[in-house]
């Protein structure tokens, strides 16, 4: 069964800066990745970035830099101030559309006990939805 992992890290240098890393553990080919915050995409969440393996990357504030790390994992740096700034309990979700598995989404947030600059290891997060 495919799995999606999500890792959230607060940068030690800038407390309003977060790095989100997501990956897809499956054998299919990824056709699209959507990163959102505030909940799953399409269920109250707001899209931060869309990554297509061949069409490129689109991102919207407070996303600063989205990129492919490997063919099956991505990273996104967020930085914000005021209303658009993420906070420690913000939920971030990654949805991977793949063929032939379909869509798989998981969410994560900053581990409650983590200090700035630290993060939980990238373990598979609970899968919220498989379309």
């Amino acid at each position: 069964t495919p799995e999606v992992w999500v890792q959230v890290r607060m940068e030690a240098t800038e407390l309003s800066s977060f790095t989100i890393r997501c990956g897809f553990l499956g054998s299919g080919s990824i056709s699209l990745v959507t990163v959102s915050w505030g909940g799953p995409n399409g269920a109250g969440g707001t899209t931060l970035a869309v990554l297509h393996p061949e069409r490129g990357i689109r991102q919207w504030a407070p996303a600063r830099q989205a990129r492919w790390e490997t063919q099956s994992s991505i990273s996104l740096i967020l930085e914000g101030s005021g209303a658009s700034s993420p906070c420690a309990n913000t939920t971030f979700c990654c949805k991977f559309a793949s063929f032939p598995e379909g869509s798989w989404e998981a969410c994560g947030s900053l581990p409650p006990s983590s200090d700035p600059g630290l993060s939980a290891p990238p373990t598979p997060a609970p899968i919220l939805r498989a379309d």
């Epitope: 707001t46 069409r55 490129g56 990357i57 919207w60 492919w68 063919q71």
Partner: antibody, heavy 114, light 113 residues
């Protein structure tokens, strides 16, 4: 099918503003971002910016940051681009295009003339 | 900003001939993470909006005839039409799909003799 509808033409006076519309149909408006592109004869295509209707947040080409303002009205599935302080160099054909530029509107011709 | 330079600016060929046009970018359009080139080609016929032909430097959009082929990597890209048809009369644009702002080339105008 996915369609983007734009009015055919706008005639405006120098120094004024114009608000161009792009009405979307055939898909969920909030899940597909809208780009705006300028075409002047002999000058090629220029990307002005994009806006994601789900978050109302735009990105701008720095060149157009003080010229264009992108907004959306999700209730009518319409994207708008307001152009201000119009001058002759703003006379052009303006297109809206969906997502990764895979669907285009027919374009609106803006003519700035006194 | 990434500058896209196309050549030639125009060319005139007879139906059935093979055509190649070039597009060069001022920075690499290769994504190191997934080894994909973020370059697209568009066809704009007179009086019509642009139409997506090729994305990812070499992937044809669905419905695009297989006489259109995209190739290249990094900063140098080519669009080839293997056997030009009368309906291919158009301006062809390449586009940086890699990073904001999404710059286009100046276009290559294809005329049919």
């Amino acid at each position: 099918q996915v369609q983007l509808q734009q009015p055919g033409a706008e005639l405006v006076k120098p120094g004024t503003s114009v608000k161009l519309s792009c009405k979307a149909s055939g898909y969920q408006f909030t899940s597909y971002w809208i780009n705006w592109v300028k075409l002047r004869p002999g000058q090629g295509l220029e990307w002005i910016g994009d806006i994601y209707p789900g978050s109302y947040i735009p990105n701008y080409n720095e060149k157009f940051k003080n010229k264009a303002t992108l907004t959306v009205d999700t209730s009518s599935s319409t994207a708008y681009m307001q152009l201000t302080s119009l001058a002759s160099e703003d006379s052009a054909l303006y297109y809206c295009a969906g997502g990764y530029f895979d669907v285009w509107g027919a374009g609106t011709t803006v003519t700035v003339s006194s | 900003d990434i500058v896209m330079t196309q050549s030639p600016s125009s060319l005139s060929v007879s139906a059935g001939e093979k055509v190649t046009m070039s597009c060069k970018s001022s920075q690499s359009l290769l994504s190191s993470g997934n080894q994909k080139n973020y370059l697209a080609w568009y066809q704009q016929k007179p009086g019509q909006p642009p139409k997506l032909l090729i994305y990812g430097a070499s992937t044809r959009e669905s419905g695009v005839p297989d006489r259109f082929t995209g190739s290249g990597s990094g900063t140098d890209f080519t669009l080839t039409i293997s056997s030009v048809q009368a309906e291919d009369l158009a301006v062809y644009y390449c586009q940086n799909d890699h990073s904001y702002p999404y710059t286009f080339g100046g276009g290559t105008k294809l005329e049919i003799k």
